[in-house]
Amino acid sequence: IVLRPSRVHNSEENTMRALTLKDILNGTFSYKTFFPNWISGQEYLHQSADNNIVLYNIETGQSYTILSNRTMKSVNASNYGLSPDRQFVYLESDYSKLWRYSYTATYYIYDLSNGEFVRGNELPRPIQYLCWSPVGSKLAYVYQNNIYLKQRPGDPPFQITFNGRENKIFNGIPDWVYEEEMLATKYALWWSPNGKFLAYAEFNDTDIPVIAYSYYGDEQYPRTINIPYPKAGAKNPVVRIFIIDTTYPAYVGPQEVPVPAMIASSDYYFSWLTWVTDERVCLQWLKRVQNVSVLSICDFREDWQTWDCPKTQEHIEESRTGWAGGFFVSTPVFSYDAISYYKIFSDKDGYKHIHYIKDTVENAIQITSGKWEAINIFRVTQDSLFYSSNEFEEYPGRRNIYRISIGSYPPSKKCVTCHLRKERCQYYTASFSDYAKYYALVCYGPGIPISTLHDGRTDQEIKILEENKELENALKNIQLPKEEIKKLEVDEITLWYKMILPPQFDRSKKYPLLIQVYGGPCSQSVRSVFAVNWISYLASKEGMVIALVDGRGTAFQGDKLLYAVYRKLGVYEVEDQITAVRKFIEMGFIDEKRIAIWGWSYGGYVSSLALASGTGLFKCGIAVAPVSSWEYYASVYTERFMGLPTKDDNLEHYKNSTVMARAEYFRNVDYLLIHGTADDNVHFQNSAQIAKALVNAQVDFQAMWYSDQNHGLSGLSTNHLYTHMTHFLKQCFSLSD
C-alpha cells in the first residue's frame, strides 16, 4: 500500500487548500528531473537555469561555462550538441514539430576554438535530422529525404543518397509508421562506434495508401495533409539497409545489407540496428506476422567491400503464445568479446528475463529468473550488468535498478536502489557515463521526484542533482489526495489497481467513482510514480474516487496476462475494468449510481466499449481520440496483436470489436466523444464513424472536436478539453459548480 500523506491535521485544516483545475492547467505542481548530458566517463554538460551550457567534471569537482546564453540567444537556440572532439557545438533553432518524435530545425555550427560561427558551406534549412559522428567532428544530416556527410563542419557536403522524395522515399529518417510503431525515433541512421561507417535505412512508401485530412488554418481554403499511412492489411513500406564508408564515401558507395532468407520470403519489417564494432553490425528483422524475429550479425568483408551475414550468426526469436517481444522486440547489449550479447526475452515460464547468448538462442544462459520481469538493460561493463526490474516486494508497478557482477562466479546480484529512499522512491531510471564510471538515478515517485549522482564502482551517492525543493514547499499547504496501490484476485487473474482517494476520505461514506483507463497491449497504468494532474484535482477538490486498473493485456506480469488479448482486442481489457468496478462497489464506499469511465486513445476505445457493455454499471463516460475499428489503425501496431483483417485470418474479430457495432448500447449512458480533426495517429475518421453509427441508431450523445489539433490536443485545447470534461463529469455526478 502506498499512502501519499495529505498532511492534514485539524489545527492546520484552515491553512490547507484543495487543488484547483487552474493549478493543473497552469502546471503549478510540475516537477523537474536532471539527466546529465554525458561527454566522458566523468564529465557531463547541463544547461543552467540562465541558459549557459556548463561542463561539470565529477572528479575535479569543477564546472565552467563552455557556451554563453548570449551565443545561444544570438540564433534563438533551443538545443545544442557538442562534437566528440570538443571543437564544435551545433545549435538548433526554429524547431518545427512534425509527428511524435520528428521535427525539422535550423542548425548553426559554432567553433569553440575561435568563438565564431562556422562560415562557408553552411547547412541548408530546414534539416530533418543532424548528428555528429561518435569520434571527431564529422556530420551526417538529412535534408529533403536525402543523407549528406561532412568530414568537417566547414567542408562542402558529400551527398550519399539521391532518390529521396517527399512522401515517397525516405533516407535516414523513418516514414510515419516506422517512426510511430517500430523505431520510436526521428532518425534511421547509425554511426559505427568510431565513425568509420554510417548505416542507414531507406523506406519506400510509393505503394502505401495515403490518409488525407483537412487542415483548416486561416486561409480561404483548407490545406489537405497527405500521409502515406498503412492501415491494417494495407500495403506496407519496403525497407532496405545500406552502409557507407565515411572515410572514402565515393569509393564503392552505399552497400546494401542482405535480409535473412527466412525473413525475405514474405512481407517483413526492419526493427533495429546495433553496431558491435566498426566492422560488425547487428540487424533485427521481423516478419509481418509479428511472432518471428531474426537477429542477424553481419561482418565487413574488406576484400569485397561488402557486408556478410552468415546463417550461423542468425538468431531466431519466436513466440507461440503471442507476438514476439513486449511492445517492441528487445535489442541486444553486446559484451566485450563483440559476439556474445545479453537480451531480454520470455523464459520457459513466460516471464521476460535477461539471457546471455554466446552461440545459439537454444543454448542461452538465463541470467535473471522469477515471477517478475526484467525491463531494461542499461549497461554492460567488463564486470557488471545494470538492469531494471519490478522484482522488489512483488509490486509490478515499481522499477528498481540492479547490478549483477558478471566478472565473478557465481554472479552476484545487488539492488542498487531498493533501500535508498524507500518511501519516496520506488520507480527509477538511470543514465550511465562511459564505462559506467558514474551514473545518475532519476526517481519518479511515489514521493516528489529526485535526481542523484552516484559512483559507478561503489554506488555511493555523490550529490543531489535535483530535489524539487520549490515543489515540496508549494505542496505544503495543499490537500493532496491519498493514493493506494493494491491488487484484486479474480478467477486466477491478478488485477492491480491504483486508487486515488479524497483527502478526508471516510470509508463509511459513499463517493462517486471515475475509472481512468488506457489498457493497451503491453502498457502499464498502475505505477508507483508521482503526479499532480487532473485526476488529483478531481479527488482533492471534487471529492471523487479515481481508480486505474491493469487488466489482461498489460505488461510486466508475465506472458499469460500479456498475451491473453492476442487476436482478441477489445474483449478482456473491457471485462477486467468491469470486474474491478464490481469489486470496488463491494468495498462499500462507492455510490453505484455515480460511476464514470474515461480514456484517451486506446483508453478511449476501452471506455467506449465499457460504456456499451450493457452492464448498467456506468452512468457516463468520455472517449478522447478513440480507436473505433482496428481496420482504421496502423498496420504495424494493429497486426502485431490482431493478425490480418482477411477472411482466412482474423477479419471476424476485426468486425466484432468495433465501437460502431455496439451503437445501440449507448442509449442508456451519457457519452462524451472528443477528437482533434488533425489527428495523424488515430484519425478523426474513428470518431466520425462512431458519431455516424450513433446518429443512425438515433442515440443521443455529446461531442467536441478540436480543429487542427493532433492526437495530443495540446496548447489552449488542453485547457478547453479538461474544463469541458470537468463540467461533463460534475453534471453526471450532480456536483455543484
Partner: nanobody, 115 residues
Framework: QVQLQESGGGLVQAGGSLRLSCAAS????????MGWYRQAPGKRREWVAT???????NYADSVKARFTISRDNSKNTVYLQMNSLKPEDTAVYYC?????????WGQGTQVTVSS
C-alpha cells in the same frame, strides 16, 4: 578567477623542437580535459591537441605524429612537445580546457618557425 599561463615559445629553425607548458591556477585543476590551440597571423584560432580527464589524447591531422600533449597532475601543468616543426606551425599557442572555458583565454606564447 581561472588563470592559464602559457610559456616555452620562441624562435626555432624548421625541423627543430619546442616544449610548451601551461600552468593552471585560480583553483583550476589540470585533471580537467585540456587542450592546446593556436592562432596563426591573419587566421582564426584553431584546435591543436586534447588530453582528456582519463589521459586519452587527440590531435589535429596537421600535427599528428609530430606533437605530443601530456600532463603532470602534481604540478597542475599541461605540456605540448612539438617536434619536426614547420614554418606553417608559426602561431600564438594557447592552452585552455577542452572544450574551452568561455571567455577565458590567456596571453598565449609565440612560436615562430623559420625556414
Amino acid at each position: 578567477q581561472v588563470q592559464l599561463q602559457e610559456s616555452g615559445g620562441g624562435l626555432v629553425q624548421a625541423g627543430g623542437s619546442l616544449r610548451l607548458s601551461c600552468a593552471a591556477s585560480g583553483g583550476f585543476d589540470s585533471r580537467n580535459a585540456m587542450g592546446w590551440y593556436r592562432q596563426a597571423p591573419g587566421k582564426r584560432r584553431e584546435w591543436v591537441a586534447t588530453i582528456t580527464s582519463d589521459g586519452r589524447t587527440n590531435y589535429a591531422d596537421s600535427v599528428k605524429a609530430r606533437f605530443t600533449i601530456s600532463r603532470d597532475n602534481s604540478k597542475n601543468t599541461v605540456y605540448l612537445q612539438m617536434n619536426s616543426l614547420k614554418p606553417e606551425d608559426t602561431a600564438v599557442y594557447y592552452c585552455n580546457a577542452a572544450p574551452p572555458i568561455f571567455g577565458s583565454w590567456g596571453q598565449g606564447t609565440q612560436v615562430t618557425v623559420s625556414s
